[in-house]
Amino acid sequence: MGVEGCTKCIKYLLFVFNFVFWLAGGVILGVALWLRHDPQTTNLLYLELGDKPAPNTFYVGIYILIAVGAVMMFVGFLGCYGAIQESQCLLGTFFTCLVILFACEVAAGIWGFVNKDQIAKDVKQFYDQALQQAVVDDDANNAKAVVKTFHETLDCCGSSTLTALTTSVLKNNACPSGSNIISNLFKEDCHQKIDDLFSGKLYLIGIAAIVVAVIMIFEMILSMVLCCGIRNSSVY
């Protein structure tokens, strides 16, 4: 006999919630794998910055995305399938995963706050490499997509460390409308915007982290309530 009443409502709420979570994970994983395995991006491994081999911050970022997407899909599946099948085992595993993820988020938050300058530096390097790839290999649509995301999200274009060729390509093709790369030495410098995000606008990242943490706690409560409801319904 299945769960009834309010518990049934929780069951479907948990299912929908985790289905969306699973889908989001799938999208992130798909995009990350596309970025990683597309031949144009793979060329980045063999790219040279002047006479020095390019550091692979670009790939580190992509591997983080792959991991995040995979974990989201796995946890989403556990919640989804556990709720619809009314499986105490799956829901218990789901709850355990959420507790681990919550602990990881708290740890990552503390680590991120302590190392925010290094993270900002890595994000800038990631942007520079994506931009370099988009210019050097003008067929690299994935790198162009990364650059476009940076430009539109941060409302910036380029940086004060650009090469002549990159400046020319950006000016003609890759700056969001309204931003003027030619304005006094890049007023809308993406490096500056990234620094601003990790210093002045750190509260935005904090708010996002709190929202994610609240959702996790909410899901933990729902999964426990449903688990108890399943146990109680199986008694009768």
Epitope: V135, D137, S160, A164, L165, T167, L185
Partner: antibody, heavy 119, light 112 residues
Framework: EVQLLESGGGLVQPGGSLRLSCATS????????MSWVRQAPGKGLEWVSY????????DYADSVKGRFSISRDNSKNTLYLQMNSLRAEDTAVYYC????????????WGQGTLVTVSS | QSVLTQPSSASGTPGQRVTISCTGS?????????THWYQQLPGTAPKLLIY???NRPSGVPDRFSGSKSGTSASLAISGLRSEDEADYYC???????????FGGGTKLTVLG
């Protein structure tokens, strides 16, 4: 050895057209930006245009914008410059040059081809 | 009138040290764009001599050196030889004009 060989220059009347070619060898043409630079007789160098490796990006000097068109055929390792509505001030030796992304400059040049615009 | 200003001529005797200047502005050399130098021997195509302000491509003798300070760059040739007689051009990128810019060129004459 990197080689760039321009051809197609000659005498043309004002308002006329000409198409320059630049045959290349000794480097992976299809993965390099290419450019045209010109030099009027007894004068200095002037950048004319560039084109990206897969022809996605290109740009021109204001003095030739709307009249000149740069293109490439990666299967033939050849760069082109289509010049229309030619003027007397376009008279120059036209050099094709490879653009090095790493060094951010024109690292290899052809020997040039002379274009004379005169009536 | 070139965006980058070079002296029209320079001269020196064999063995001497000669310096050629290249003056730009805050929209090209001063904006952080690298300065490059090209040598054009009589009747030939330009050849890259110095790139990235002070780097020599392989095959270029260490008698040639480049430097940059503020909105100016300079090319120094030490131990001058007769085969150094040529036109020398500096080149950078101008962010206001959005074009690659060259100096007007300096004709170097080796005397004696």
């Amino acid at each position: 050895e990197v080689q760039l060989l321009e051809s197609g220059g000659g005498l043309v009347q004002p308002g006329g057209s000409l198409r320059l070619s630049c045959a290349t060898s000794g480097f992976p043409f299809s993965s390099n930006y290419m450019s045209w630079v010109r030099q009027a007789p007894g004068k200095g160098l002037e950048w004319v245009s560039y084109i990206s490796s897969s022809s996605t990006y290109s740009d021109y000097a204001d003095s030739v914008k709307g009249r000149f068109s740069i293109s490439r055929d990666n299967s033939k390792n050849t760069l082109y410059l289509q010049m229309n509505s030619l003027r007397a001030e376009d008279t120059a030796v036209y050099y094709c040059a490879r653009y090095s992304y790493g060094r951010d400059n024109f690292d290899y040049w052809g020997q040039g081809t002379l274009v004379t615009v005169s009536s | 009138q070139s965006v980058l200003t070079q002296p029209s001529s320079a001269s020196g005797t064999p063995g001497q040290r000669v310096t050629i200047s290249c003056t730009g502005s805050t929209s090209n050399i001063g904006a952080g764009y690298a300065t490059h130098w090209y040598q054009q021997l009589p009747g030939t195509a330009p050849k890259l001599l110095i790139y990235g302000n002070s780097n020599r491509p392989s095959g270029v003798p260490d008698r040639f050196s480049g430097s940059k300070s503020g909105t100016s760059a300079s090319l120094a040739i030490s131990g001058l030889r007769s085969e150094d007689e040529a036109d020398y051009y500096c080149q950078s990128y101008d962010t206001n004009l959005s074009v690659w810019v060259f100096g007007g060129g300096t004709k170097l004459t080796v005397l004696g």
